[in-house]
Each structure stands twice: as C-alpha cells, then as structure tokens.
Amino acid sequence: DIGISGRHSITVTTVASAGNIGEDGILSCTFEPDIKLSDIVIQWLKEGVLGLVHEFKEGKDELSEQDEMFRGRTAVFADQVIVGNASLRLKNVQLTDAGTYKCYIITSKGKGNANLEYKTGAFSMPEVNVDYNASSETLRCEAPRWFPQPTVVWASQVDQGANFSEVSNTSFELNSENVTMKVVSVLYNVTINNTYSCMIENDIAKATGDIKVTESEIKRRSHLQLLNSKAS
C-alpha cells in the first residue's frame, strides 16, 4: 500500500506479508528519509487495537501508549530509520497478530501513512524420504508445522498431470502447542528414475519437496514461498 496524507505529504510504502507463528516476523514499511533522526516519528497501529503497536521518536522507543498485547515484542531497525526504513520487528508472532496495520510517519518534510495486511499461520519446509519400512516402494513427505490445515498434492515428472490421490495417504497430527500441525503424506508404488514432488499449500504459503531416486543415489530439493506478499 502507498499512502499520502496532509498538506505536506510524504510517501510511505508497505508490503503485505505473513508471519510464521512462534518465530520472529517483519512488517515492512519504508518512507522518504529525513536528514535528522530526532525529527522522525514512527507509529505503528493495528485496526481494532486501542493502544499503539509501537512508537519510535527522537531516536528511541516511546512505549508509554503501547498496547499490552505487543509489550516486549516490538522493535524497529533503529540504525536504518535515518535511511527511511520503518519496518517493525515482531518477536514470537502469535495467531492473533493477524490483521490490518498502519505505518504512520512524521518527518520535517510532512506526514504520511500506509496500511498493510498481515497474515499469520505456520509453514515449514517439507522433507521427502524413501520409506524403507514399507512393503512396496514408498515415499514419505513430512513437514513439521502448518496452519491452517494445508492441502497436499503429489506430482511426478514422468507422469505429468497424473492424479496420485488414490495412491497416497495424508495425515495431520496436532503439535503440542495445540495450534500447528505436523503434515505426513505417503505415496505408494513409486518407480525409480523418476522425480516426485510433494506440494503443501495453504492460504499463506506454498512449499515443495522434490526427490529423485535412481539406482545409485537419492537427490532431494525443497523450497518455500509466501503467497500474497505484494508491494503496493
């Protein structure tokens, strides 16, 4: 989102992003820099929350108006404020941190603000292995932390477009903190010299684990991408 406000306005830019619960998150916000740190005020607000998420002014945190739910968990990159970085660091992201945030900036040049949508959930890299305990050639795809419950789809390089739902079995096991789940998917009747992909996706992230099994070696690769992380 790009926002401009007031008679003397400055451009503020945010990027919609997602937080992985239990880990540190970043809410991105940049603005036209000012030459004096003491002239910059950064305020982060959240829709539906009475107090401030964070305030940084005169080169330091000003947390007297901070809302209880954010106490002890927020910071800006103090050394980067002078170059126009107002991004917020959020420690130990909670499910309830999801929502609409406003990054509001005051400098000697003017004021500006922009909103961003912050999604929260859990996402992790899948690992695909050959299941040697199984009676037939079987692959096992495991990812430790997902929320909300994702879909799991298997694909193959050789049989492109094939539907593996009949020869796969996926289970979701609730983790100890009772929010995130472990994803386990098993693919049966696999053939060697073929590359198989286990694709896990929810509305926050998409992750893929690839495995290629040949007579002599096993090659693995995995990657994860966040969805809807768009700048505007």
């Epitope: 239990g22 880990e23 540190d24 940084f56 080169g59 330091k60 945190d61 947390l63 209880e68 739910m69 106490r71 002890g72 968990r73 927020t74 910071a75 800006v76 990159f77 103090a78 420690k91 130990n92 909670q94």
Partner: antibody, heavy 121, light 110 residues
C-alpha cells in the same frame, strides 16, 4: 536496582518434578522476557526457553519441550520453571536471565545467581 | 540446530587489546542474530556485556565493545584488566531460539 533472585538448591529423586523460582525486583516485570538457561560441566550453556510474563507467551527449545514448563505470576513478580520426569541428565545449574527486546537495546542484562539441581536416588 | 563456535581459550596481558570471536555453522553472523556476549566469573556470577551485536547495557565498562568482523561476531576488550579474567559466552538468535557458544576462557597474565 534490577535483581533476579532464584530459589535454593534442590536434591530430587529420579522421576520426580521440581519447580524453580526466579523473583524479579527493580523493574517492570511484565515487559521483559525471562530466559531459562542450563549449565552442566563440559556442556557449556544451553537455552531452555523463554517467557514474556505480561502475556504468558512462551517459546521452548525443541529439546526441552516435554521437560520444562514456564509460568509467571505478575502479582509477585516471579517466574517459574517446572522440570518433570527428572533423570541424572537434568542435574545441572539452572539460571534465569532478563532479556530486553527493543529498537535500540536488546540484551541479556541481568542474571540470577543460579539454582543447583541434583538428581540422585 | 546451528552450532556456535568460540575459541576455547585465549591469553592476554593487562593493558592489551584482545578480540574474542563467535562463528555460526549456518553461515555469516548478521545483525539479525542479535549477538550477545555474557561474562561468567567464579561462583556462577553472570553479567551481560553486549547485546544486539554492539549494544552495551548500562554499567558495563566502555572497554568492552561488540562488532561483526567478517562473517563472525566479535567481542573486543580494549585495555584488558586483571578482573577481566573470566569465561565469555556468545549467544546467537536464530529466528525462534538462542544458541550459546562453548565459551572462551580468557586468562589475563600478571
């Protein structure tokens, strides 16, 4: 003056549970993280996890997820760590430490004096 | 899990400058690892010296400073004093957990 005062040494039997306390004075207890750290001879320092007393938000080292449970009582400014199903591997000195997370300052600035736990039959 | 490596022991003399380092098995240490340095003296006496790579808590003498040198975090003691003889631990943050190094035993001769 900021201080963290831990409970005294404990001698426990295998299989038992123990609760170690860490009383904070001299600052706003709810706004700072309390970190828990284990020290065994020859093993250096091991991070067990952390709690933010004001909200009760916790984070555990995967290794200690089933071993340790953190709680905090803001009325008495005291953080607690309960260790369950004790074995000889749990014999160690346990520390609480204050961690401040902010834009300009983020550090372990104050440590408790340590609580020695001995597990023996 | 990441492994954090420190020099096991270093020796210096009063007035000298000594640098202790902290390496991460996952690659270069960055400001996002919030490198912390903690001093341990006999009788389980721990003191936080540096946080967030280069921040000194109130009361810590100015001779202690933190930085990034190459791909490592570093603690520099400028004008070492005899009372600086201690074990120094670094701790690095990895998005959701801390990992401590094995500690450096600093001996100050004389």
């Amino acid at each position: 003056q900021v201080q963290l005062q831990q409970s005294g040494a404990e001698l426990m039997k295998p299989g038992a549970s123990v609760k170690i306390s860490c009383k904070a004075t001299g600052y706003t207890f709810s706004s700072y993280w309390i970190e828990w750290v284990k020290q065994r001879p020859g093993h250096g320092l091991e991070w067990i996890g952390e709690i933010l007393p004001g909200s009760g938000i916790t984070k555990y080292n995967e290794k200690f997820k089933t071993k340790a449970t953190f709680t905090a009582d803001t009325s008495s400014n005291t953080a607690y760590m309960q260790l369950s199903s004790l074995t000889s591997e749990d014999s160690a000195v346990y520390y609480c430490a204050r961690y401040y997370f902010g834009s300009v300052n983020f550090y372990f600035d104050c440590w408790g004096q340590g609580t020695t736990l001995t597990v023996s039959s | 899990q990441a492994v954090v490596t420190q020099e096991s022991a270093l020796t210096t003399s009063p007035g000298e400058t000594v640098t202790l380092t902290c390496r991460s098995s996952t690659g270069a240490v960055t400001t996002s690892n919030y490198a912390n340095w903690v001093q341990e003296k006999p009788d389980h006496l721990f003191t936080g010296l540096i946080g967030g790579t280069d921040n000194r808590p109130p009361g810590v003498p100015a001779r202690f400073s933190g930085s990034l040198i190459g791909d490592k975090a570093a603690l520099t003691i400028t004008g070492t004093q005899t009372e600086d003889e201690a074990i120094y631990f670094c701790a690095l943050w990895y998005s959701n957990h801390w990992v401590f190094g094995g500690g450096t035993k600093l001996t100050v001769l004389g």
